[in-house]
């Protein structure tokens, strides 16, 4: 008798059962369908380190890392200041409670976004036209 399960019809690690009249797939947690082809939970069994959270979607999964961590599983130390979160030349410092900007003279705000003297010039330095919020950072 031919072992029809040798053709490995079950996807994503599902267990093949030859019932004689038909084949059945017993799916692992997070998968469904006759051949376990549907990924119900992209994040099943995936761990993100250092407080990262698994983000599902599109048949793939990735970790969204907590501030200060990066890499595929959030195991790598990342510099949260590398994204340049302070405006107008402010200097970024990573603090245990979050980021801190030390503003250049003449600017204020958590991210140094506002001029100190409201009666001064009415325009801020122009934004570079090539950069759009949402575009990849250069």
């Amino acid at each position: 008798r031919v072992d029809r399960c040798s053709l490995q019809p079950c996807r994503n690690g599902g267990l093949c059962l030859d019932l004689g009249h038909a084949l059945r797939c017993r799916c692992r947690a997070g998968f469904a369908g006759p051949r376990c082809e549907h990924d119900l939970d992209d994040c099943a069994g995936r761990a993100c380190a250092n407080g990262g959270t698994c983000v599902e979607g599109g048949g793939a999964h990735r970790c969204s890392c907590a501030l200060g961590f990066g890499g595929r599983d959030c195991r790598e130390r990342a510099d949260p200041c590398a994204a340049r979160p302070c405006a107008h030349g402010g200097r970024c410092y990573a603090h245990f409670s979050g980021l801190v900007c030390a503003c250049a003279p003449g600017y204020m705000g958590a991210r140094c976004e506002f001029p100190v003297h409201p009666d001064g010039a009415s325009a801020l330095p122009a934004a570079p036209p090539g950069l759009r919020p949402g575009d990849p950072q250069r």
């Epitope: 204020m108 976004e113 934004a127 950069l131």
Partner: antibody
Framework: QEQLVESGGGLVQPGGSLKLSCKVS????????VSWVRQAPGKGLEWIGY????????YYASWVNGRFTISSHNAQNTLYLQLNSLTAADTATYFC?????????????????WGPGTLVTVSS | DVVMTQTPASVEAAVGGTVTINCQAS??????LSWYQQKPGQPPKLLIY???TLASGVPSRFKGSGSGTQFTLTISDLECADAATYYC???????????????FGGGTEVVVK
């Protein structure tokens, strides 16, 4: 793909409370914050407040007066808006919105990605 | 708090025409002025930020100008698809309370004939 999806809206009695959730994905909080904005049926947009998770700061419109609270959780992938002491005037669609704060050293403060919104109806 | 006064409340223009929407801030907001377009049943869409910079994918028919307290959105070569409500939005910072806040204008309905 940057995305924000609100949930938790529904019918609530006057004086009641509701907690709205906003699931976010696809962007880094070093450069972006998340704002809550509401819109009553047939009316304009009204800003409620915003959270800047990387800096641990939350700001509110003065009219909120402590009734609403914005918080974040779980490596900042889910944000919340707690609504308390609700009245009929709070009936609105509540939007969760990404705010481009400072990107690559340039300040923007524009709301560039909007969720579809969740409807809150306050009625007895 | 900053109050944003948007005028007119409604404006009608023909296809191919030009529409101008004004937004006045009650105090100096520098360049922190954004414009949004909203169509019925949809969330708003960012058109312009930092007074005059077009958001990704927005046609150059949309033009923002101004600074300080007076701002303008101009839509030229009007198309039927431009029929929508337009909102201005400011960001300002109160140094006394270390307080950053946003405010929206009341909206302008654009009707395209």
């Amino acid at each position: 793909q940057e995305q924000l999806v609100e949930s938790g809206g529904g019918l609530v009695q006057p004086g009641g409370s509701l907690k709205l959730s906003c699931k976010v994905s696809g962007f880094d909080f070093s450069n972006y914050g998340v704002s809550w904005v509401r819109q009553a049926p047939g009316k304009g947009l009204e800003w409620i407040g915003y959270i800047d998770p990387a800096f641990g700061r939350t700001y509110y419109a003065s009219w909120v007066n402590g009734r609403f609270t914005i918080s974040s959780h779980n490596a900042q992938n889910t944000l919340y808006l707690q609504l308390n002491s609700l009245t009929a005037a709070d009936t609105a669609t509540y939007f969760c919105v990404r705010v481009a704060l400072v990107v690559a050293g340039v300040a923007y403060y524009g709301m560039d990605v909007w969720g579809p919104g969740t409807l809150v109806t306050v009625s007895s | 708090d900053v109050v944003m006064t948007q005028t007119p409340a409604s404006v009608e223009a023909a296809v191919g025409g030009t529409v101008t929407i004004n937004c006045q801030a009650s105090q100096n907001i520098y360049s922190y002025l954004s414009w949004y377009q909203q169509k019925p049943g949809q969330p708003p869409k960012l058109l312009i930020y930092r007074t005059s910079t077009l958001a990704s994918g927005v046609p150059s028919r949309f033009k923002g100008s101004g600074s300080g307290t007076q701002f303008t959105l101009t839509i030229s070569d009007l198309e039927c698809a431009d029929a929508a409500t337009y909102y201005c939005q400011s960001y300002y910072y109160s140094s006394g309370s270390s307080y950053g806040a946003f405010a929206f204008g009341g909206g302008t309905e654009v009707v395209v004939k």
